[in-house]
């Protein structure tokens, strides 16, 4: 932004009424009037070029400094060429000197040279030669100097002539201000320019109405340079929640729009399944039956819990059940659907029921499932099971109702055989097993699977209709893993636990060692 000039003294505009002091009195500088464009113009001139040792002073009236720290002095003047005078006027000069003096009071006509400090020697860029002068075509020079810092209540300027032919047409004294400014939704007040050329005055800005400094952001600041220019903006303000930037102001969001935080973004239209918002809304409330999860952004539509899983099947496979379902027909508008499976078992004889999470095994953790199937194993025979599959999403926790579907299945499979080691040798293991008598009639064979411990790459299978088997051709001093499974007309029954049995080492007895009951 361009600097603003505050004028303290303007000789040209004063119309000759300033009455500056000349010294010596009545000699040297003189106030003259000329007509230019039918308007009187005034100037102070001096032209004592023929006489040597000139020391003519022209002092301004006392100028009140006010708030100025550094003043700028603009001079408009003409200087006659010394060669335009007869004999070149050996004592003729083509420069004059500019002085200033600070004081807390007006000394009136009491003029003392010693109080004045020289600012500079003022030399013209162009001098007026004889031919110009005769054609009334004078060369006007413009020079500017600055002084600062000033500290007293006021000051004088003085012009010393040392033998030149000078006409002073304009003396303008001013100081500079950085103008009032609106930038980055911050207001910066009019600020006096500093006095020291290299320094920049730091000025704090104030956020405009309904604007704030964003969290973690820098307070708005600008720097006012000596020349009255604003430089180096730092930080900014942003329109607060519920307001958006319109030119250099923050305007409330229109009804039906919202803005949930201080940001540069405009107000957004209320998303789906929200109620129309009032003016200046920071969010849009959800319609009845719709919700926002804590982590949902305000720009996301309101959503609701899903409907129940659409279709659920429970397929019994021996001591296992495969549960399969399809996603809810209504997802509630969300993609974060997860499923939870719970299990209840009922004894057919008593009708007594209870949870069965502790006794069954799921193919993957039954809570927070993202897939639509799970296998439940280790089910007990002659038991009725009811499985509940619940669909949940990010807003299910905000309502008390649940969305679930249930499926029931009866397990008719045999109980796992109870296995024991009857005897062993260096190369064989004798194994027996039992199941409850009521179930024996449904078993047509038993399958014995055995393998070396640590080796699941190979295994052996023996099938038998009896309740015992001798596994031979085994390696000495080797641990075997043995499992017995009943085979029924429906397929495989429940398998026994996997048992560890070890053959004898060659140093031990070669006979079959019998294990006592």
């Amino acid at each position: 932004a361009q600097g603003k000039e505050v004028v303290l003294l303007d000789f040209a505009a004063a119309g000759g009424e300033l009455g500056w002091l000349t010294h010596p009195y009545g000699k040297g500088w003189d106030l003259m009037q000329n007509i230019m464009n039918d308007m009187p113009i005034y100037m102070y001139s001096v032209c004592n070029v023929m006489s040597g040792d000139q020391d003519n002073w022209l002092r301004t009236n006392w100028v009140y400094r006010g708030e100025a720290e550094r003043i700028f002095i603009e001079l408009k003047f003409t200087v006659r060429d010394c060669n335009s005078f007869p004999g070149g006027a050996s004592s003729c000069k083509e420069t004059f000197n500019l002085y200033y003096a600070e004081s807390d009071l007006d000394y009136g006509t009491n003029f003392q040279k010693r109080l004045f400090t020289k600012i500079d020697t003022i030399a013209p860029d162009e001098i007026t030669v004889s031919s110009d002068f005769e054609a009334r075509h004078v060369k006007l020079n413009v020079e500017e100097r600055s002084v600062g810092p000033l500290t007293r209540k006021g000051f004088y300027l003085a012009f010393q002539d040392i033998g030149a032919c000078v006409a002073l047409l304009s003396v303008r004294v001013y100081y500079k201000k950085c103008p009032e400014l609106l930038q980055g939704l911050a207001h910066f007040p009019e600020t006096i320019a500093g006095s020291d050329a290299p320094s920049l005055a730091t000025v704090a800005g104030t956020c405009v109405d309904h604007a704030v400094v964003p969290p973690g952001g820098e307070e708005p600041r600008m720097h006012c340079a000596v020349d009255g220019e604003w430089l180096v903006p730092i930080g900014q303000c942003l329109c607060q929640a519920g307001y958006e930037k319109v030119e250099d102001a923050c305007q409330a969001c229109s009804p039906g729009f919202f803005k949930f935080e201080a940001s540069e973004s405009p107000c957004l239209e209320c998303p789906e399944h929200t109620l129309p918002s009032p003016e200046g809304a920071t969010s849009c409330e959800c319609e009845e039956g719709f919700f926002r999860a804590p982590q949902d952004p305000a720009s996301m539509p309101c959503t609701r819990p899903p409907s129940a899983p659409h279709y659920l099947t429970a397929v019994g496979m021996g001591a296992k059940v495969e549960l399969r379902w399809t996603p809810p027909q209504d997802s509630g508008g969300r993609e974060d659907i997860v499923y939870s499976v719970t299990c209840e078992q009922c004894w057919p004889e008593s009708g007594e029921c209870g949870p069965c999470e502790a006794s069954v095994r799921y193919s993957e953790p039954p809570h927070g499932l993202t897939r639509t199937s799970v296998t439940v194993s280790d089910l007990e025979p002659h038991m009725n099971y009811t499985f509940t599959v619940e669909a949940r999403n990010g807003v299910s926790g905000l309502v008390t109702s649940r969305s679930f579907r249930t499926a029931s299945v009866s397990i008719n499979q045999t109980e796992p055989p109870k296995v024991r080691l009857e005897g062993r040798s260096t190369t064989s293991l004798s194994v027996s097993w039992s199941i409850p008598p009521p179930q024996q009639s449904r078993v047509w064979k038993y399958e014995v699977t055995y393998r070396k411990k640590g080796d699941s790459n190979s295994y052996n299978v023996r099938r038998t209709e009896g309740f015992s088997v001798t596994l031979d051709d085994l390696a000495p001093d080797t641990t075997y893993l043995v499992q017995v499974q009943a085979l029924t007309q429906e397929g495989q029954g429940a398998g026994s636990k996997v048992h560890e049995f070890q053959t004898l080492s060659p140093e031990g007895s070669g006979n079959l060692a019998v294990i006592g009951g």
């Epitope: 070396k452 411990k453 080796d455 699941s456 790459n457 190979s458 295994y459």
Partner: antibody
């Protein structure tokens, strides 16, 4: 749940040695064998052999006899594949895999370790 | 060694279509214990193979029922009844009847 987690990628020069690890969790490590499978870039799968995790006895496929060694650190439930005197053709992804819920087939696999051999 | 042959190398399909992936072994895969140890795996880019079907026709836990396996002796087929985007990848057949265990070269299922 059952997991096989393998060590990270390796960049080696020909002639060097590499040792890849496979850490098992979620089951009894010493009950089930550990197999190793090689997959060269853009190629199919090649079974390298297996180790009995209880006895430590290794079995190698014919193409992997000599420079290849399977070993165990039972206390850490970890199996190792070491390849000595590396050659450019050893550049591949190596998988550990184990028959656990089903016998005699690879139903659980590690995520694979990429080995690059280049001078 | 038993050689497992998979053709074609690439099988373009449209989503929702049925896909059939054949696999042939150089000798019978029937074990002396009566089992046929022929399995199918799916490998997606940057991942390890995942077991889909074991012993010819048994679906592994969590595998959708659109996958089915069939065959006997030396000729086997994996069928996908309605191909979904998540089914794309390389399908390998594998045998563990005979040592060394061997894998087919793979068939890449891709969008037509």
């Amino acid at each position: 749940q059952i997991q096989l987690v393998q060590s990270g990628p390796e960049l080696k020069k020909p002639g060097e040695t590499v040792k890849i690890s496979c850490k098992a969790s979620g089951y009894t490590f010493t009950d089930y064998s550990m197999n190793w499978v090689k997959q060269a870039p853009g190629k199919g799968l090649k079974w390298m052999g297996w180790i009995n995790t209880y006895t430590g006895e290794p079995t190698y496929a014919d193409d992997f006899k000599g420079r290849f060694a399977f070993s165990l650190e039972t206390s850490a439930s970890t199996a190792y594949l070491q390849i000595n005197n590396l050659k450019n053709e050893d550049t591949a992804t190596y998988f550990c895999a184990s028959p656990i819920s089903l016998l005699r087939l690879l139903d659980y696999w590690g995520q694979g370790t990429t080995l690059t051999v280049s001078s | 060694d038993v050689v497992m042959t998979q053709t074609p190398l690439s099988l373009p399909v449209s989503l929702g279509d049925q896909a059939s992936i054949p696999c042939r072994s150089s000798q019978s895969l029937v074990h002396s214990n009566g089992n046929t140890y022929l399995h199918w795996y799916l490998q997606k880019p940057g991942q390890s193979p995942k077991l889909l079907i074991y012993k010819v026709s048994n679906r592994f836990s969590g595998v959708p029922d659109r996958f089915s396996g069939s065959g006997s002796g030396t000729d086997f087929t994996l069928k996908i009844s309605r191909v979904e985007a998540e089914d794309l990848g390389v399908y390998f057949c594998s045998q563990s009847t005979h040592v060394p265990w061997t894998f087919g070269g793979g068939t890449k299922l891709e969008i037509k």
